[in-house]
């Protein structure tokens, strides 16, 4: 998601013209607008493929656009978490990957990205109403999740290229803060260079260097890369019937390496109750005193060490947790 | 209360196969997965696998995955565990058992006893 | 897989005592382990989940402690209903093992 503004050279005041304070006046807009032009609207791409070579076997792809530390993937099916998804794998930077059958291979694929081979065979195959769920918890973005699946029509070894799906959640303590702050000082900047444009010359002026005014634009992957993600998105094509009640709304996901301790009742969710959370259904970050934080969702009262805020500086594949195991 | 009431015992013979039931009351059957496993006489439980039945889609441990087929019907809220090519080794207690979010199994069935004898 | 190696394999002890059994697990799993007790001819009753939570009405004599590749439960002032065999299990990924199980006798 990519927003382009027309934004004005700003030139440095003539010395002399308002001495310190013109200089301090500046500093403040250019210090905004880098915030400005910095502060994109994270999104996360899915991509389900059905492998050519094993009929029964799906490769799910999800990658997230955003400038933030990845701390959590978290892959479900069955719809967003806490809305009947049941979690296939999680995968952690430090702590490693976790998976459930029917998937096969966990993996980082870049610091943004992960992929997973589901297999089956006959009945043990994804639905035809399967959607997979990838859900990304970075900071500080906060959590953003999309769906995806196979088009009914797919031909094996074909797939939708990846696209962001439309179910974009952001978890708002993640997000509040920091979008208030960056929202508050775009605007402050835009009233900064409006109250300069009606000031004499030569406060503000187009740039000498530039025929056309530089743009500001918020975060995004190069447009190349875009092109590449931004395509319809997927679902999966199978021998299974749909459930047979609406009202599913199962779970999050598995209580990670322990969770926050909290004392909700017994959730009701199932099988994955990692990143449940009470409706609305949006994870929801809190920070814990000890500078980790963990997904807290309504959940039994849990205790334990609770995530590592930072991901390993090595990178996602640092330690991929206790995986020689199967 | 949530309550997992499993089939009767079953006595087959080498090579037969054998289909025990899962009834679930107590809760909403499609928001749990339902798992299988098995106690061997004098041995330790083993994990067969387990049904999503939002889904239907089962998981199973790869020792168990051309042995067993994990089903699931909604409709009367009731996981199956099919198992196939039975000899004496299949001889157990079955349990079928509903886990908690990824977490632990939080109620199981009574259990199934299968013999496995000519 | 990951494998869980339980001891002993068996203990007697009397009413009143304390016992401490382990479950030593192969990689490292976190705070991923649940121990259940199990009488004779029934099915296992979950006592411990996420290493040290307690469940639903598990009396307080029971608690379970480490996390990583070792863990413990120990039971304080046992009771007669406490006698059984007892299961360490691990949650980390599939597929899910158990330990060899420890049976706990009436001396």
């Known amino acids: 998601m990519r927003t382009e503004a027309q934004v004005p050279a700003l030139q440095p005041p003539e010395p002399g013209l308002e001495g310190a304070m013109g200089h301090r006046t500046l500093v403040l807009p250019w210090v905004l607008l880098t915030l400005c032009v910095t502060a994109g609207t994270p999104e996360v791409w899915v991509q389900v493929r059905m492998e050519a070579t094993e009929l029964s076997s799906f490769t799910i792809r999800c990658g997230f656009l955003g400038s933030g530390s990845i701390s959590l993937v978290t892959v479900s099916w069955g719809g967003p978490n806490g809305a009947g998804g049941t979690t296939l794998a999680v995968l952690h930077p430090e702590r490693g990957i976790r998976q459930w059958a029917p998937a096969r291979q966990a993996r980082w694929e870049t610091q943004s990205s992960i992929s997973l081979i589901l297999e089956g065979s006959g009945a043990s195959s994804p639905c035809a109403n399967t959607t997979f769920c990838c859900k990304f918890a970075s900071f500080p973005e906060g959590s953003w999740e999309a769906c995806g699946s196979l088009p009914p029509s797919s031909d094996p070894g074909l797939s939708a290229p990846p696209t962001p799906a439309p179910i974009l959640r952001a978890d708002l303590a993640g997000i509040l803060g920091v979008s208030g702050v960056l929202l508050f000082g775009c605007v402050y900047l835009l009233h900064l260079l409006r109250r300069h444009k009606h000031r004499p010359a030569p406060r503000l002026q187009p740039s000498r260097t530039s025929p056309q005014a530089p743009r500001a634009r918020a975060w995004a992957p190069s447009q190349a890369s875009q092109a590449a993600l931004h395509v319809p998105y997927a679902t999966i094509n199978t021998s299974c019937r749909p459930a047979t009640l609406d009202t599913a709304h199962p779970h999050g996901g598995p209580s990670w390496w322990a969770s926050l301790p909290t004392h909700a009742a017994h959730r009701p969710q199932g099988p994955a109750a990692w990143a449940s959370t009470p409706i609305p259904a949006r994870g929801s970050f809190v920070s814990v005193e000890n500078g980790l934080y963990a997904q807290a969702g309504e959940r039994p009262p849990h205790t334990g060490p609770g995530l590592t805020l930072f991901p390993d500086p090595r990178g996602p594949r640092a330690m991929e947790g206790p995986l020689g195991v199967r | 209360e949530v309550q997992l009431q499993q089939s009767g015992p079953e006595l087959v013979k080498p090579g037969a196969s054998v289909k025990i039931s899962c009834k679930a009351s107590g809760y909403p059957f499609i928001n749990y997965n339902i798992h299988w496993l098995r106690q061997s006489r004098g041995k330790s439980l083993e994990w067969i696998g387990y049904?999503?039945?939002?889904?239907?889609?089962?998981g199973y441990n790869q020792k168990f995955k051309s042995k067993a087929t994990l089903t699931a019907d909604n409709s009367f809220s009731t996981a199956y565990m099919e198992f196939r090519s039975l000899t004496s080794e299949d001889s157990a207690v079955y349990f079928c058992?509903?886990?908690?979010?990824?977490?632990?199994?939080?109620?199981w069935g009574q259990g199934t006893s299968l013999t496995v004898s000519s | 897989d990951i494998q869980l190696t339980q001891s002993p394999a068996s203990l007697s002890v009397s009413v009143g005592e304390t016992v401490t059994i382990t479950c030593r697990v192969s990689a490292n799993i976190y705070s991923n382990l649940v121990w259940y007790h199990q009488r004779q001819g029934k099915s296992p009753q979950l006592l411990v989940y996420?290493?040290?939570n307690l469940a639903d009405g598990v009396p307080s004599r029971f608690s379970g402690s480490g996390s990583g590749t070792q863990f413990s439960l120990k039971i304080n002032s046992l009771q007669s209903e406490d006698f059984g065999s007892y299961h360490c299990q691990h949650f980390w990924s599939t597929p899910y093992t158990f330990g060899g199980g420890t049976k706990l006798e009436i001396k």
């Open positions: 996420g290493g040290t």
């Open positions: 049904v999503y039945p939002y889904n239907g889609v089962p």
């Open positions: 058992a509903r886990e908690r979010g990824r977490d632990y199994f939080d109620s």
